[in-house]
C-alpha cells in the first residue's frame, strides 16, 4: 500500500531512509537537458523474494539532442557526498552493514540522474531527520517519521525535531544536541 | 491520556515576578518541546518561546527576552516560565502547548496584574 | 517576523452551511502552518498541521489547504459545535506568529 502523502517537512531539516521497503517506488528522472530512453522503464521498483531484496529496472537517461547511447556509473568520488557521522548517520552505517530483511539499499546513482530523486513509499517505511548544515537540533524527541495506516488512510507520524540557527545556553550543560553534519543528508531527498 | 496541567490564577502586584508550571502527563515528556503561548484582548495569541524538555535549551520570542524564563525540570516532568517585572501589559492568560504542532494544549493560567 | 493576516475576522453561519477561512502570510512559510480552534473559555485545539493533515480525531469535514503565502481552512456542513474562533499560526522559524482570529458565529 502506497503512503498517500510526502513525509512531513520539517522547518530546516532533512529526511533520508536507511533503506526502503519492497514496494517502493524511485522515479526515473532526468537532468535538464536529459530524457528517459524510451525503452526504459519510468521507476524502479524495490522487489524481492524471502532471502533478498533489490531494485528492478534500471533508470537510464539520454541526451534530449542527441542520439547518444548512455550506461549507467558510479559517481567519481567528488561526485559522491562525504557523510560525517552523527547519530542518524550511524543508523544508516549500521543499516549498511546489515541489509534489512524486506527492504532494499539505496540505488546507486545513474548517469544524468535528476538532482532530485522522487520516491514513493509504501506503509511501514520510515525516514529519519536531521538539521541541514548552519542549524542545530533544539530539540531532538523522536526525530523520525513512519508511514502507518490508521481507518483505512496512510499518515505520517510527527517528527519531533525543531532545528534553530540561534545559539542559545542550555539550561543542562553538556546535553547540547550535536551540531548536525554540514554534508549528512543531501537535500535533494524528496517523496510523492 | 495526554495532560498537559498547568498551575493556578495569580493576582500580583506590579513589579514583582511570578512562576507559572506546566506539567505533562500521559506521554513521554523529554520527547516533546515545550511552547509558551500568551492570550491577550489586545493582542491575541502571542508566541513566546519553546524549550527543549530533553535539554533545556530556549529559543525566545525576542519581544518576549529578559520578560519570560523558562526552565524545565524532567524529574517531575514539569515545565516552568517565569515572568519578571510585571505590569499591567502582563495581565493575559498564558498557555503552555507541546511539540513541533502545538498538538495539546495546558487548560491556560491566568496572571492578573493589578495593585 | 512573518505576519498571519487572516479574514474574515468574524462570520456568521448557519448549521449545514460551508465556510472558508484564509490566511495570509507576509512572507513564504511553505507548508509551514496549522490551524486551531478555540471554543470561549477553553484553550485552543490543533485541527490541522502542516496546512493539510488532520490532527488525530478532528473530523473530516474540517480541510485545510494552501502553502507558500495563501493558506485556508474549509468546514464542510457546519455542526453546532463548530462555532468559535479560528487561529491560523506559521512554525517556519521563529518567533512562531498567529493569525488575528476569526470568530465563526451562528446565524
Known amino acids: 500500500e502506497l503512503c498517500d502523502d510526502d513525509p512531513p517537512k520539517i522547518t530546516h531539516a532533512t529526511f533520508k531512509a536507511v533503506a526502503y521497503k519492497e514496494g517502493t517506488m524511485l522515479n526515473c528522472e532526468c537532468k535538464r537537458g536529459f530524457r528517459r530512453i524510451k525503452s526504459g522503464s519510468p521507476y524502479m521498483l524495490c522487489t524481492g523474494n524471502s532471502s533478498h531484496s533489490s531494485w528492478d529496472n534500471q533508470c537510464q537517461c539520454t541526451s534530449s539532442a542527441a542520439r547518444n547511447t548512455t550506461k549507467q556509473v558510479t559517481p567519481q568520488p567528488e561526485e559522491q557526498k562525504e557523510r560525517k557521522t552523527t547519530e542518524m548517520q550511524s543508523q544508516m552505517q549500521l543499516a549498511d552493514q546489515v541489509s534489512l530483511p524486506g527492504h532494499c539499499r539505496e540505488p546507486p546513482p545513474w548517469e544524468n540522474e535528476a538532482t532530485e530523486r522522487i520516491y514513493h513509499f509504501v506503509v511501514g517505511q520510515t525516514v529519519y531527520y536531521q538539521c541541514v548544515q548552519g542549524y542545530r537540533a533544539l530539540h531532538r524527541g523522536p526525530a523520525e517519521s513512519v508511514c502507518k495506516m490508521t481507518h483505512g488512510k496512510t499518515r505520517w507520524t510527527q517528527p519531533q525535531l525543531i532545528c534553530t540557527g540561534e545559539t542559545e545556553p542550555s539550561q543542562f550543560p553538556g546535553e547540547e544536541e550535536p551540531q548536525a553534519s554540514p554534508d549528512g543528508l543531501p537535500e535533494s531527498e524528496t517523496s510523492r | 491520556q495526554v495532560q498537559l496541567q498547568q498551575s493556578g490564577a495569580e493576582l500580583v502586584r506590579p513589579g514583582v515576578s511570578v512562576k507559572i508550571s506546566c506539567k505533562g502527563s500521559g506521554y513521554t515528556f523529554t520527547d516533546y518541546a515545550m511552547h509558551w503561548v500568551k492570550q491577550s484582548h489586545a493582542k491575541s495569541l502571542e508566541w513566546i518561546g519553546v524549550?527543549?524538555?530533553?535539554?533545556?535549551?530556549?529559543s525566545y520570542n525576542q519581544k518576549f527576552k529578559g520578560k519570560a524564563t523558562m526552565t524545565v525540570d524532567k524529574s517531575s516532568s514539569t515545565a516552568y516560565m517565569e515572568l519578571a517585572r510585571l505590569t499591567s501589559e502582563d495581565s493575559a492568560i498564558y498557555y503552555c502547548?507541546?511539540?513541533?504542532?502545538?498538538?495539546?494544549w495546558g487548560q491556560g493560567t491566568t496572571v492578573t496584574v493589578s495593585s | 517576523d512573518i505576519q498571519m493576516t487572516q479574514s474574515p475576522a468574524s462570520l456568521s453561519a448557519s448549521v449545514g452551511e460551508t465556510v472558508t477561512i484564509t490566511c495570509r502570510a507576509s512572507?513564504?512559510?511553505?507548508?509551514?502552518l496549522e490551524w486551531y480552534q478555540q471554543k470561549q473559555g477553553k484553550s485552543p485545539q490543533l485541527l490541522v498541521y502542516?496546512?493539510?493533515t488532520l490532527a488525530e480525531g478532528v473530523p473530516s469535514r474540517f480541510s485545510g489547504s494552501g502553502s507558500g503565502t495563501q493558506f485556508s481552512l474549509k468546514i464542510n456542513s457546519l455542526q453546532p459545535e463548530d462555532f468559535g474562533t479560528y487561529y491560523c499560526?506559521?512554525?517556519?522559524?521563529?518567533?512562531?506568529?498567529f493569525g488575528g482570529g476569526t470568530k465563526l458565529e451562528i446565524k
Open positions: 502542516n496546512a493539510k
Open positions: 499560526q506559521h512554525h517556519y522559524g521563529t518567533p512562531y506568529t
Open positions: 524549550i527543549s524538555t530533553y535539554s533545556g535549551d530556549v
Open positions: 502547548a507541546r511539540g513541533v504542532t502545538f498538538d495539546s
Open positions: 512572507e513564504n512559510s511553505y507548508s509551514y
